[in-house]
């Protein structure tokens, strides 16, 4: 059929909870393409009816929820004007969550289930929750060794758990839990993470690379809405915190009352050797006080800033 086959990594998932996989393969999916999902080489596409337990939602395949019998190879076919790619995704469903029983539990952990904290540093864990826009995620709860995490060293920030002054006792088995709402129905998502502690300053000496911004200014009109992406590449097993700060404060905290400037939800695309992360900053309305301030994107030890500036007067208007 002239489609080029691409084999993705295996995904190991928990039964009885929602799961979604996005058919993206940059740069193929960056243009105008059609995406169709199939299961186990079936000629019949996955349903697009949102009431179906398994259905296609834009470029995503969505399981509400995943069941034991859903294991298998799924294909998404990406058709462009002059190209066709078939991406194979092997989904393996395990039955039980670790905190309920060790029987039938998750075998051989993949990268998303392993994270590292750096001893003596302020660090973070990430709850990998990847779902289409039709799914609304509630606040995240974090557990360590099957008990809910409480204490002043721990702060929940969107999909991350911030851990200050990491100690050796912070190693162990963590889980993040969120309530997902789709078409009025609620589902529980619970992801396990095994956490190890390292004394090294960074994973394998690797430093995250901020691709954009590049310490530059952006011309923007007063009163307009502005969204700026911070694009970061980092190793697949990194635990670096990615965020926007102003005056050395998280923008969500700095603008806590007005909520005029907010950090977006982080997304990422997985490549063979690295991940590409995107976290945006949204200015609902640019004000005079925003000009000249460096808005910093942080990724681990890496930083880059943007500075807003008023556009130069356009004398042709006079």
């Amino acid at each position: 059929d002239g489609c080029k086959d691409i084999f993705m990594k295996n995904e190991i998932l928990s039964a009885s909870q929602p799961f979604a996989f996005n058919c993206t393969f940059p740069p193929i999916t960056s243009g105008e393409v059609s995406v169709t999902w199939y299961k186990n080489s079936s000629k019949i596409p996955v349903s697009k009816i949102i009431q179906s337990r398994i259905h296609q939602d834009e470029t995503w395949i969505l399981f509400l929820p995943m069941e034991w019998g859903d294991s298998g190879v799924y294909q998404c076919v990406i058709k462009g004007r002059d190209s066709c790619h078939r991406i194979h995704v092997n989904l393996t469903v395990f039955e039980k969550h670790w905190c309920d029983t060790s029987i039938g539990g998750l075998p051989n952990l993949s990268d998303e289930y392993k994270q590292i904290l750096h001893l003596g540093k302020d660090d973070s864990l990430t709850c990998h929750l990847h779902f289409p826009k039709s799914c609304v995620l509630g606040p995240i709860k974090w557990y360590k060794d099957c008990n809910e995490i409480k204490g002043e060293r721990f702060t929940v920030l969107e999909t991350r758990l911030l851990v200050s002054n990491v100690s050796a006792e912070d190693r162990g088995n963590y889980a993040c839990q969120a309530i997902l709402t789709h078409s009025g129905k609620q589902y529980e998502v619970l992801n396990g993470i095994t956490v190890s502690i390292t004394e090294r300053a960074g994973y394998g000496g690797s430093v995250p690379k901020i691709i954009y911004p590049k310490n530059h200014s952006i011309e923007v009109q007063l009163g307009t809405t502005l969204i700026v992406d911070c694009n970061v590449t980092d190793t697949k097993d990194n635990t670096n915190l990615r965020c926007w700060r102003v005056n050395n404060t998280l923008v969500d905290d700095y603008y806590d009352e007005s909520k005029r400037i907010r950090e977006g939800v982080e997304t990422h695309v997985s490549f063979r050797e690295h991940n590409l992360y995107t976290v945006n900053i949204t200015f609902l309305e640019v004000k005079m006080e925003d000009y000249g301030l460096p808005f910093m994107c942080h990724a681990g030890v890496s930083t880059a800033y943007i500075i807003l500036q008023l556009p130069a007067p356009d004398f042709r208007a006079y």
Epitope: C99, D100, S102, G104, Y113, D145, C146, G172
Partner: antibody
Framework: QVQLVQSGAEVKKPGASVKVSCKAS????????MHWAKQAPGQGLEWIGE????????NYNQKFQGRVTMTRDTSISTAYMELSRLRSDDTAVYYC????????????WGQGTLVTVSS | QIVLTQSPGTLSLSPGERATLSCRAS???????LHWYQQKPGQAPRLLIY???SRATGIPDRFSGSGSGTDFTLTISRLEPEDFATYYC?????????FGQGTKLEIK
């Protein structure tokens, strides 16, 4: 290194109870499930149940349900398995074994505790 | 529950020979959840092979495992004197956990 050290041999009368201990060292006790298994003389292995030391959640084999109680004391990294209403066919070596997250198998075992039920 | 049946019950071989031990499950077991243990008299069992074919730490490469679904095999390519023991297969897929009844490997 990881060690699971069990309590010594016990002789009990039918109808009595026995409580076997398993002291863990060399790893974070609260991070792994602890399982118990039975091996009658000259017989194979039989699974009794499991306990998560941090949450105290237990799951028992239906066959032992009602007679077995698993507990733990996290302050001394020790798991306990108590078997009540003992019968002669409970005479066996009882083992504790540990299971790690993402590794659903018994990589570490205690040395075993012989429980003899005799009138 | 999943019943595991091992065969033969006893296997009599000489050092240097090849041993093939079988474990059959009453229903399908994922390869991730089928394991083999070795036990010598008066000792606790020792993990030999996990997830059907992965050797545990310190286990020599003469031990290998294979199989899928309901049929699994433990092979010892060239028997050493210390290999004579009882071998158990075990499933970790569903509760209750079950073991095979064991295969006793004895010196001929």
């Amino acid at each position: 290194q990881v060690q699971l050290v069990q309590s010594g041999a016990e002789v009990k009368k039918p109808g009595a109870s026995v409580k076997v201990s398993c002291k863990a060292s060399g790893y974070t006790f609260t991070s792994s499930w602890m399982h118990w298994a039975k091996q009658a003389p000259g017989q194979g292995l039989e699974w009794i149940g499991e306990i998560h030391p941090n949450s105290a959640k237990t799951n028992y084999n239906q066959k032992f349900q009602g007679r077995v109680t698993m507990t733990r004391d996290t302050s001394i990294s020790t798991a306990y398995m108590e078997l009540s209403r003992l019968r002669s066919d409970d005479t066996a070596v009882y083992y504790c074994a540990r299971v790690d997250y993402g590794k659903p198998w018994f990589a570490y075992w205690g040395q075993g505790t012989l429980v003899t039920v005799s009138s | 529950q999943i019943v595991l049946t091992q065969s033969p019950g006893t296997l009599s071989l000489s050092p240097g020979e090849r041993a093939t031990l079988s474990c059959r499950a009453s229903s399908s077991v994922s390869s991730s959840y089928l394991h083999w243990y070795q036990q010598k008299p008066g000792q606790a069992p020792r993990l030999l092979i996990y997830s059907t074919s992965s050797r545990a730490t310190g286990i020599p490469d003469r031990f290998s495992g294979s199989g899928s679904g309901t049929d699994f095999t433990l092979t010892i390519s060239r028997l050493e004197p210390e290999d004579f023991a009882t071998y158990y297969c075990q499933q970790f897929q569903s509760s209750p956990l079950t073991f095979g009844q064991g295969t006793k490997l004895e010196i001929k």
